[in-house]
């Protein structure tokens, strides 16, 4: 028996669906009564799903593990994590018994992007050339820890005077602050970049500061420029700030968050107080640094129909807003291959080969290609159904005559993530079924 | 003392152009977002446009917004207000008024608009 | 958009007398409300701001009222100079800021 799973470890975004890939190989006659699954963790052996006695025995792990019971007698022992945390990393172990018995470990690798960093002056106003100042660089809910960079507005790294901190919160997930102290020359840009090492993303934010201030009074409202894109199921902030006036109060604030196009009431603060919110008891302000000017909004458990724009709109004597744009993504699944006919295939045959991949969004672009990794266009159908949560569904199909033997692939990709997930099948010229036998 | 002085009314023809101006003494005018209302004869105050204190900001009434435009010049210490395809609607008694906390603290004598044929 | 419904839209009453009006809110506004005062030919006139703050130089038999969406404007002792036309206008949220439709006051 010969039990697979992937050399590299499964990269999983904190709040999605991973699924740890293990496949064997049954004999003939095998059936899903002689199966003995097992998956657990390496490490401690703590159990964590099974299949026993013909049937599922159920998750053994927070209720958050399901196999794919259809999949499985033809060797497909998966195992699908949901709602992956930050505790969830680490290696896991398919073991397969039927008469023969087999097993593999699986490495699981969380993360999570860190959001794009936050620039803070201290002091911040009244700045002349010569003053020391101090520019914090914060960035959240990441993981695992960032690399943190500094330069100048000609790409030279800063790396004097620079204390970074990263502190893990309940979840797992890290926030960073990094400052920067530096002497002002008559006027200067300051860039942070906080790179996440294993999904080589890097989020970065610069400040350019000019010694001579304008008229204080005036509000200034910003929201980051390029959308905020926040994977199903996690938490999404969604950045504004605006410039407090000396001797501002919270008691003068009126903020409020509203639906762009609807001017659907989000979440507001005004009288003094944070007055909640009236959407879906999904979002929250952060009530410690509105003094500081930070009226950003954190939306929880983010849905498809989260999507669009969001107005930040604040007033204390003078007013402002700016809108912010939340694009929803959600990965791929790795995609399942199947075959009809799939069994005595001969050169000549007219084979119908489907890719599917699971739960994503938004909408993939699929391509096919053979062995050679030329594309194949002809005869293929692809359908993209979504479900309740708006989630789609992708199955293509590609219709082929066989040749002596060949490989296809199905590629499925993440248009906003710039995800790709493939699969292959690779049928061999004498006559044969699918998936092999032992 | 604060003082807003509105110019720039007359009498127009439809589709014609009109641009208000309301003159500002005795504040820091950047410091403050400025409004314009208008009074159709007889009718009663309806809030036409608004622009925050850096200029950076412009919000308008359904009616009139893609016709008007409102605009400032701080250095001048003058508000505008350009009105382009005038429809006999428009007519009305403007006023600019200066925003406060988040109320109108002062406000113009008003200029005059007379959109007819 | 919010809509402000002002009532009475006119109302007749003798020096000394006490009057109030009111003004409804279609979403709650938080208390974001001015209330002016304006007489014929002339620019309307701040009375009160923020529900219940009297503006500077107001006399002390004005008073405003009221939280939520529910709002009014009292007179506790009519004098001859308060004949005029009285507007709330709400300052809550993205603009348009709308006025109230006005109440007319008039001597009986």
């Known amino acids: 028996l010969e039990v697979q799973v992937p050399e590299d470890p499964v990269v999983a975004l904190v709040g999605t669906d991973a699924t740890l890939c293990c496949s064997f190989s049954p004999e003939p006659g095998f059936s899903l009564a002689q199966l003995n699954l097992i998956w657990q963790l390496t490490d401690t052996k703590q159990l964590v799903h099974s299949f026993a006695e013909g049937q599922d025995q159920g998750s053994a792990y927070a209720n958050r593990t399901a196999l794919f019971p259809d999949l499985l007698a033809q060797g497909n022992a998966s195992l699908r994590l949901q709602r992956v945390r930050v505790a969830d990393e680490g290696s896991f172990t398919c073991f397969v018994s039927i008469r023969d018995f087999g097993s593999a470990a699986v490495s699981l690798q969380v993360a999570a992007p860190y959001s794009k960093p936050s620039m803070t002056l201290e002091p911040n106003k009244d700045l002349r050339p010569g003053d020391t100042v101090t520019i914090t660089c914060s960035s959240y809910q990441g993981y695992p820890e960032a690399e943190v960079f500094w330069q100048d507005g000609q790409g030279v790294p800063l790396t004097g005077n620079v204390t970074t901190s990263q502190m893990a919160n309940e979840q797992g997930l890290f926030d960073v602050h990094s400052i920067l102290r530096v002497v002002l020359g008559a006027n200067g840009t300051y860039s942070c970049l906080v790179r996440n090492p294993v999904l080589q993303q890097d989020a970065h934010s610069s400040v350019t500061i000019t010694p001579q201030r304008s008229p204080t009074g005036a509000v200034e409202v910003q929201v980051p420029e390029d959308p905020v894109v926040a994977l199903v199921g996690t938490d999404a902030t969604l950045r504004c700030s605006f410039s407090p006036e000396p001797g501002f109060s919270l008691a003068q604030l009126n903020l409020i968050w509203q639906l762009t196009d609807t001017k659907q009431l989000v979440h507001s603060f005004t009288e003094g107080r944070d007055q909640g919110s009236a959407y879906a008891n999904r979002t929250a302000l952060f009530p410690d640094l509105l003094a500081q000017g930070n009226a950003s909004l954190r939306l929880q458990r983010v849905r498809v129909a989260d999507e669009g724009s969001f107005t930040c709109f604040v007033s204390i004597r003078d007013f402002g807003s700016a809108a912010v744009s939340l694009q929803v993504a959600a990965p791929y699944s790795k995609p399942s291959m199947t075959l009809e006919p799939n069994k005595d295939l001969r050169p000549g045959d007219t084979v119908t080969i489907t890719c599917s991949s699971y739960r994503g969004y938004p909408e993939a672009e699929v391509f096919w290609q053979d062995g050679q990794g030329v594309p194949l266009t002809g005869n293929v159908t692809t359908s993209q159904m979504a479900n309740e949560q708006g989630l789609f569904d992708v199955h293509s199909v590609l219709r082929v005559v066989l040749g002596a033997n060949g490989t296809y692939s199905c590629l499925v990709r993440n248009p906003v993530l710039q995800q790709d997930a493939h699969g292959s099948v690779t049928i061999t010229g004498q006559p044969m079924t699918f998936p092999p036998e032992a | 003392e604060v003082q807003l002085v509105e110019s720039g009314g007359g009498l127009v023809k439809p589709g014609g152009s009109l641009r208000l101006s309301c003159a500002a003494s005795g504040f820091t005018f950047s410091s403050y977002g400025m409004s314009w209302v208008r009074q159709a004869p007889g009718k009663g105050l309806e809030w036409v446009a608004a622009i925050s204190g850096g200029g950076n900001y412009t919000y308008y009434l359904d009616s009139v917004k893609g016709r008007f435009t409102i605009s400032r010049d701080n250095a001048k210490n003058s508000l505008y207000l350009q009105m382009n395809s005038l429809r006999a609607e428009d007519t009305a008694v403007y006023y600019c008024?200066?925003?406060?906390?988040?109320?109108?603290?002062?406000w113009g004598q008003g200029t005059s608009v007379t959109v007819s044929s | 958009d919010i809509q402000m419904t002002q009532s009475p839209s006119s109302l007749s009453a003798s020096v000394g007398d006490r009057v109030t009006i009111t003004c409804r809110a279609s979403?709650?506004?938080?208390?974001?409300l001015a209330w002016y005062q304006q007489k014929p030919g002339k620019a309307p006139k701040l009375l009160v701001y923020a529900a219940t703050n009297l503006a500077d130089g107001v006399p002390s038999r004005f008073s405003g009222s009221g939280s939520g969406t529910q709002y009014s404007l009292t007179i506790s002792s009519l004098q001859s100079e308060d004949f005029a036309t009285y507007y709330c206008q709400h300052f809550w949220g993205i603009p348009p800021w709308t006025f109230g439709g006005g109440t007319k006051l008039e001597i009986k």
């Open positions: 979403e709650n506004i938080y208390s974001n």
């Open positions: 008024a200066r925003q406060g906390l988040r109320v109108m603290d002062n």
